[in-house]
Amino acid sequence: GSERTCCPVNWVEHERSCYWFSRSGKAWADADNYCRLEDAHLVVVTSWEEQKFVQHHIGPVNTWMGLHDQNGPWKWVDGTDYETGFKNWRPEQPDDWYGHGLGGGEDCAHFTDDGRWNDDVCQRPYRWVCETELDKASQEPPLL
């Protein structure tokens, strides 16, 4: 397909990516599915500059990002390497806390009210941010 030169309506362009900020809450998996149906993914934070951009738009509200450890190690949904990548956890996080009484630990990452990250129960209905790269957004997948 022809290269997309701008973001879809209601999305915000920043540094060759498009971002969509929800104003309602969903469980992490449902938020992830919403982004994927928009040919996007939950936001992957790769720099302090991107962190500040997202933080500015979401405000002091718990908001899901595309980072989870539901299958063991922490992973970004787009395959970005976690170990060598940008991190902005709150002190003593992630802690996989079991004391919430909801069963299991905490496997999904979110921005907290100060922007730093925390792991939490994936079923909590938090706001979320979708991201898609402009160049990637322009390409049609091969036909089946």
């Epitope: 449902d30 919403y34 928009e38 040919d39 979320w128």
Partner: antibody, heavy 121, light 107 residues
Amino acid sequence: EVQLLESGGGLAQPGGSLRLSCAASGFTFRSYAMSWVRQAPGKGLEWVSVISGRGGNTYYADSVKGRFTISRDNSKNTLYLQMNSLRAEDTAVYYCAKGIAVAGSHYFDYWGQGTLVTVSS
Amino acid sequence: DIQMTQSPSSVSASVGDRVTITCRASQGISNWLAWFQQKPGKAPQLLIYAASSLQSGVPSRFSGSGSGTDFSLTISSLQPEDFATYYCQQANSFPWTFGQGTKVEIK
């Protein structure tokens, strides 16, 4: 004017295959998720599958997973449903439906007229 | 899966009547709910999305309300063209699921 026109329905044997098509017009097809929804005779509506605008992401109801495949050709403004290993319980009118993203969910805002699939020996 | 339960399954009413149909989700779905109207032999038509937003072109006598698990569709003054089957549908999580339908019949 949005138009969705399904085709490809008909009679199939149990275990057989059919391929449904949905020709779309009146909107920028590649920009919207598209779904298939079915309705067995005299019964209610059942969502079958959905595909994202560029085709990279698909989801299925458990009842058809592994047997049905949704796909699209954005150069032809056409949605497809490949139906394999058909069962009697797949007998239904199959509708294609355009999706619209509103505030964090997708809704079916336009529907085709439907095509009848009958699975019988 | 989220089960959607509509009540009543059918209702008899007269032109001009106020009719309310309810829909209950087996778990909370916030306001991620749609209502559809279907006439015999025709495709469904979107009436309400996001629980209470009226789809473009739909008469204002239709209204939706609710959040969480309990929702309703109200027709403020039933018109002859409103006799049909109505379905609710949750759009919160996969698989997307519909209620079993409510048939609005002429009394």
